[in-house]
Structures are given as C-alpha cells and as structure tokens.
Amino acid sequence: DSSKWVFEHPETLYAWEGACVWIPCTYRALDGDLESFILFHNPEYNKNTSKFDGTRLYESTKDGKVPSEQKRVQFLGDKNKNCTLSIHPVHLNDSGQLGLRMESKTEKWMERIHLNVSERPFPPHIQLPPEIQESQEVTLTCLLNFSCYGYPIQLQWLLEGVPMRQAAVTSTSLTIKSVFTRSELKFSPQWSHHGKIVTCQLQDADGKFLSNDTVQLNVKHTPKLEIKVTPSDAIVREGDSVTMTCEVSSSNPEYTTVSWLKDGTSLKKQNTFTLNLREVTKDQSGKYCCQVSNDVGPGRSEEVFLQVQYAPEPSTVQILHSPAVEGSQVEFLCMSLANPLPTNYTWYHNGKEMQGRTEEKVHIPKILPWHAGTYSCVAENILGTGQRGPGAELDVQYPPKKVTTVIQNPMPIREGDTVTLSCNYNSSNPSVTRYEWKPHGAWEEPSLGVLKIQNVGWDNTTIACAACNSWCSWASPVALNVQYAPRDVRVRKIKPLSEIHSGNSVSLQCDFSSSHPKEVQFFWEKNGRLLGKESQLNFDSISPEDAGSYSCWVNNSIGQTASKAWTLEVLYAPRRLRVSMSPGDQVMEGKSATLTCESDANPPVSHYTWFDWNNQSLPYHSQKLRLEPVKVQHSGAYWCQGTNSVGKGRSPLSTLTVYYSPETIGRR
C-alpha cells in the first residue's frame, strides 16, 4: 500500500566462508531523507520495547561516524535511493536474515534480505540444451549464484580434465534483480564427445580450485562404422569368394537398419552386417561400403575398393590426336581392361612390331608423314596376354611439299609479252585446294595452279606461288627476267654546275634508269643533226651559237628510247650593239627623232646608258631615246651602252644630223 517504503534487491544472496557478499539495493523512503540506518543480523521485534533486537552489524550515527569494528560491513548507499551493502569477508555465521532498519524524520521501515553462507565454495551448475547432436553448435552454460566486487573468481571448462580449446564468454551480474557469474561455451560436438566428461571448475583469482560441476555428454550421432574385408587387401581373382563385415563402433541412439552399397548404389537383399560374395566376376569390382541408420540419420563406412583380377581384354588404341600435323607430337594409348593393370605392351605399326615399345603409351615427339598408318597393341598382365584389337588409323597431315613456280614461255620474255606460269608440288595431305601468287596483280588464273600475265611489265621481276591445303607452302620466287628498251632517258648537264656562260667548258650526260639487256648505244642530236655517239657531249668553249634544243637516244637489242628535248642556253654580255635612228639619221628640226640601242644579249639587256659626242651620259636609260621636238643643237654623234647580268657592251658612234626647217631658213 501507499504507506510502504519501496525496496528492490535480490531476495537471497549466496556466498561461502571467507568470500564476500555484495548486496545491490535501492529504496524510496516515504518522506524526506534517511536519518538513521542499522543493519541487523536475524532481527526480532520486541513488543515490549517496540524495537528490534538482534546483532547490529552496522550502525550509522547522526554525525555519520562508523565504529572501527564495523569496517567488515559497509553501507555504500545514500540518504534517498541507494541502500547497497558489502560484507567482506563474509563468515558462515553471517547466514540468516539481514535486517535493514531505516528511519526518516517521521517514518520507520525494516527490510529483510536472506543471506546463505556455506562452509565451502558451492559448485556452479552446468546447463545443457535438451538435445546435443553431432556437428550442431551448442552452448554449454555454467552458472554460479555468486558475484562480489571484492572477491574475483573464474570459471574454467575442462573436457576429460583437459582445458577446452574453445573460448568461453564469462559475464557477471550484480544488479538489484540478480547476482551471478555465468560462463558460456559454444562448441560443435563430434560423435566422439559422446560419453565424455565436461567439467566447469570454479577457481579463485589465482586459479586455485574451489569447486566444480560435471556432466557426461550425451551426443546424438549417426552410426560410426568400420568395414573389414577378407582378404584384407580386397584383391581377388575371378571365381574367388569375398567377405565384408560391417562393425558399428558407436551409434546414438541405437541403429535400426543395415544396407550395403556398391559404387553408391544399394545392393538388394543385403541387410546384415556381413556381405558374402561368392565366385566373384570382374563386374563385381568396385567401391563397397555399408550404411547403417538410426533416428539421427544414416552413417556410412569408408569405402573398400574390391579389385577382381582378370587377364587383359582385347585392346583398343586411342590416338591423341589424329589427324596429326607433321612436326607435332602424338601419343598413342593402349587401352585394355585388365586387373592388375598390364605390365607389358607390344605395339604394331601397319602390322609390323615396333621394336623397344613396351609401355602403355607411345610418344612420338615429332611426327613425320611416314608415321601414318594403322597402330595396334597387345596388353599383358600376370594373368595372361590379351588379344590385339582392330587398331587405330593415324592420318598425318602436312603442307604441300616441294612447291615450284615454272615459267611456261620460251625465253627471253620481252616487255609486253603474255607470260604463263604454273605452280607445281610433289605431295600434299590434305589435297591442295587453292593457290596463291606473289606479288598480287590483276592477272588471270585460267585454271587451278596456272597464272597468265597479259602484257608483262618491264618491272615484273620475280613471281612466287604457294600451293595451299590447310597450310600454304611457298615456292622460291622465280625471276621473269623481262627484257625491255632503255627507260627514263634524259639529258643531264654535268658542268658547269651553275648557268652556262659563253666561253665555258660544257658537258652534257645522257642518262637512263635501266636497260635489259644492259648493252646500249648513245646518239646525240640537235635539230635533227647527229652530234655524237658517246654517253657525254662536251663543248670546250661554248658560244651563243651552240644554244638550242638537244636530244639523246639510248638503244639496246630490244629498242631505242629518246630523251625529251633539252634546251641549252648560253649566257653572254651584250654584243653587236648599234644605234639605229628613226625616221633616219637626218631629221628636220621640230620633228621627232627616235634613237634605238639594238643589241644581242642573253639574258636580255636590263639597263641602257646613252652618251653624246662628248661621251657625256644622257639622262635616258631606256632602249629608245626620243628627241621631240628635235633641235639643230641635237646634231652630233651618239652611242649607247647595254648591261645585263653577264656584263656590258657598247655601240659604235652613230651621227644624227638635224637641219633647219624651211621656216627657219625663210626667217634668215
């Protein structure tokens, strides 16, 4: 009801002699703060005095002082909500009831807590799941209803007295709800853990043994089996007898059914722990095991490989790989069912025994065409020799052999001829299916392996062909040796290196790029006139008259070729200068007189200078000197000078006579 103080704490606390007890406690007083606190041991209410009698373990005074003998018991609470207590060490005679006498200004309360102190450390308690099954992870819990800050403890797990390898998780609780220490161990038990002893050991901080709890594990598991066979090596000959026995080394719960399996398939009507095989045949070879089931599931024994021995069966040959490519490696495998495995083999190629080949495999590192044919073998073991099987065919494939390019034309071949070539080979596997030609051109292939070159070019030097099956084999190139007239004939000036000046020594060369045949003749010509028959045309001192259009010709037995016309240009200073007068050398005053400086020059005159009879230069520089109107004073001798890049030339004097007009004479 509302007149009660509210307390929360564990109902009973457990400890042992010499340990300690920590009592988590909270309260709520009816009014105000706590003024007085007494801790009683086994308090009893005295109706006469209206007070509690009993041993006072702890007493708080108004001034807060605590008598020194009370150090064993500590009140760790406060005046309004915490009433936690500690007793360290705790003694056997502390067992019983603790009474917390609380007083506030106006209210009083007695709260009781049970304390159970044993003489020796009490054992923890192991909690197991209801069922433990092999390979399924379980959690083992070890619980101890004790925890105290002043007395550290540890819980250790042991399997058959040996510390367990798995890591345990220890947790403690010191709350108003519960006080305990708990260790949880997760592990996946195996069948062999069945019946084994697991211990949770309580130890003090130094690892000293205090107490323990023990359980024997009950691990449910499928039957664990051992298979025994007679004979023990499980190797017999056809017609022998074999006995196999299945032993159950452990099963939990008990087994219910037994069966036998061969190569994973159940054997019918074999439901006992002994399997008897009488007069075995080779088909009974295989992997045998027994299977025993219980409520958890089936358990299987290890497999026994029963080998029924017999002489080799007719052999077959496996070729890796056929068809084979010449130069590759090939392996032949002789396959013959036999037990024990054959120890000796005889190999045949096209019916003839292959010497020195006694292994199961024949390896030819580099296959050649002659290796083709039929391969067969015979296998042999301790029980006898097998028969030769049908054999296997080795097909050796190779590129076409000895490929040649053949010119069908009569020789020599001339430029412009039609040339026919054929591509020949010696042998091929598989057959040749196509041909290739090098270099490529817009040529005809009138039939397989034949090439027709219409209008053969002078530069068709070599042709090669390839015969192709899965691979192409190229012939060595064949030279067509096409003959042609000299090519690219041209005139080339050898000297001088710069432009030709009159008087220079000049050499012209007749060049050509190629000629087949090589033997040639040269001809030089100017304006249709033959000048020479050497490759060079030489001028010791060139004159302007030598200028003109030159051609050279080169000929061989096939034909002749002319160069383009080449213009020879000779540079010279102005020459043959003269002054011509228009309309004449006698002109009437007042009229117009034009003097022209005529010359022969290469390059043409670029600059003219006019002089009078006093060799006085006149301020005129063009080719024509125009006097208009002409005066009598203009009469006299004139001359001109012409200049080009080569030099200067001057004319002789030419006299101009200017006479008076009739008007002037009439005035006089």
Epitope: L158, E160, S192, K196, I197, D213, V215, Q216, N218
Partner: antibody
Framework: QVQLVQSGAEVKKPGASVKVSCKAS????????LHWVRQARGQRLEWIGY????????EYNRIFKGRVTITADKSTSTAYMELSSLRSEDTAVYYC?????????WGQGTLVTVSS | DIQMTQSPSSLSASVGDRVTITCKSS????????????LAWYQQKPGQAPRLLIY???TRERGIPDRFSGSGSGTDFTLTISRLEPEDFAVYYC????????FGQGTKVEIK
C-alpha cells in the same frame, strides 16, 4: 569418497525378472552416467548398458535388447537394473560402475542365480 | 561395437618374471580432442570386483605399484609386469571406453 553399494544376492527361476539396485554416494548423482556390467563364472566382463541420471537417457547392449531396463531415482541417488525373461545363462555377478575423469568406481557386485 | 582381442588367453610364469599381455582393438580408441587413448587395464581376483590398474593406456592408477606399466596407441596396446610378485597371479582384462564399454576376453596369469 565415492561409493556404489549394491543390493544383495538373488535366486530366480527361469522366465522370472530380477531388479538389482545400486546406491551412489560421495558425488553429485546426476553428473555421471551409471553403467551395468556382468560376469558369468569364468567368462569375460560383459557391458549391459548405462543410464544418464540427469535426463534418464539409456543405452543398451543389443544382446540384452528388450530384456533389460535401467532406471534411476534422483531423490535417493539410486540406479536400478531389471532383467526379465531370465534364463540359466544369465547366472552371473552384476556390477554397477561409473567413470571419473581418470578412474573408475565399481560396486561390490550382486550375484544373480537363475535355477529351476 | 568395438571388439577387443587379448592374447594370450593364459600364461604360466614364475615370481620375478617379466610378463607381457597384448590387447588389440578392432578400431582406434584414440580420442583426438584430448590426444588420449581410451583404454584401461584391470586385475581381477576370484570373488572380487575388477581393480583398475591403468587408464588412458599408460597412466597408473593411484596406489598401483610401478612394476605395472601400459603402452601403445590407436589399436595395439600392451600391459607389462616387469617383475611378477606372488599377489600378481590373477586374471587381467583390457577395456575400451571410447564408445560404450567393451572388454577383452581376459588373460589368466598362473604360477608355473
């Protein structure tokens, strides 16, 4: 110290049943399985089965299957082995025993005689 | 179940002799989790319960004289009495306890 104290000798007629007790002391009864073993005169020791007193789980040797029942009373720390359909070849000394981590503890044995 | 085969089934010897008894299990009794062989040796005298001599194949039980020794691992085990004493004439049994319990057929050691 660990002690296993068995009940006294029994004489039974063929076809009858016998129930032998084994009182354990000196250890926590539920911590260890309790096994039963018998030995006919001049014969090898023969395992009969066990009980796990913690959960009353039992396992028996198949040769006794259907004839043997092992039970346990946690309140008195006593295990029982009952063998039914007795025949003369069941005449033997019957022992209860248990494992420790290292050692084994045996009862003193109970002679069961099957005679007409 | 695991079968135990003891040999010899009986032997005659004199005080002071060295005696060797062998025991073979049909399967290994080695428990790999703790690397121990779950094989025990017992001595039994007429009218008495079996007395444990050796556990874990080679560990002597407290109070057993050191003339008794056990050896072996897996499937093959041996009990050796180095110098036979008068009180050693008895029947000796091997027992596997890896999976349920199975006993050997016993070896009777008699006075020559």
């Amino acid at each position: 110290q660990v002690q296993l104290v068995q009940s006294g000798a029994e004489v039974k007629k063929p076809g009858a049943s016998v129930k032998v007790s084994c009182k354990a002391s000196g250890y926590v009864f539920t911590s260890y399985w309790l096994h039963w073993v018998r030995q006919a005169r001049g014969q090898r020791l023969e395992w009969i089965g066990y009980i796990n007193p913690r959960n009353d789980y039992t396992e028996y040797n198949r040769i006794f299957k259907g004839r043997v029942t092992i039970t346990a009373d946690k309140s008195t720390s006593t295990a029982y082995m009952e063998l039914s359909s007795l025949r003369s070849e069941d005449t033997a000394v019957y022992y209860c025993a248990r494992r420790g981590i290292t050692t084994f503890y045996w009862g003193q044995g109970t002679l069961v005689t099957v005679s007409s | 179940d695991i079968q135990m085969t003891q040999s010899p089934s009986s032997l005659s010897a004199s005080v002071g002799d060295r005696v060797t008894i062998t025991c073979k299990s049909s399967q290994s009794v080695l428990y790999s989790a703790v690397e121990k062989n779950y094989l025990a040796w017992y001595q039994q005298k007429p009218g008495q319960a079996p007395r444990l001599l050796i556990y874990w194949a080679s560990t002597r039980e407290r109070g057993i004289p050191d003339r008794f020794s056990g050896s072996g691992s897996g499937t093959d085990f041996t009990l050796t009495i180095s110098r036979l004493e008068p009180e050693d004439f008895a029947v000796y049994y091997c027992k596997q306890y890896l999976s349920s319990w199975t006993f050997g057929q016993g070896t009777k050691v008699e006075i020559k």
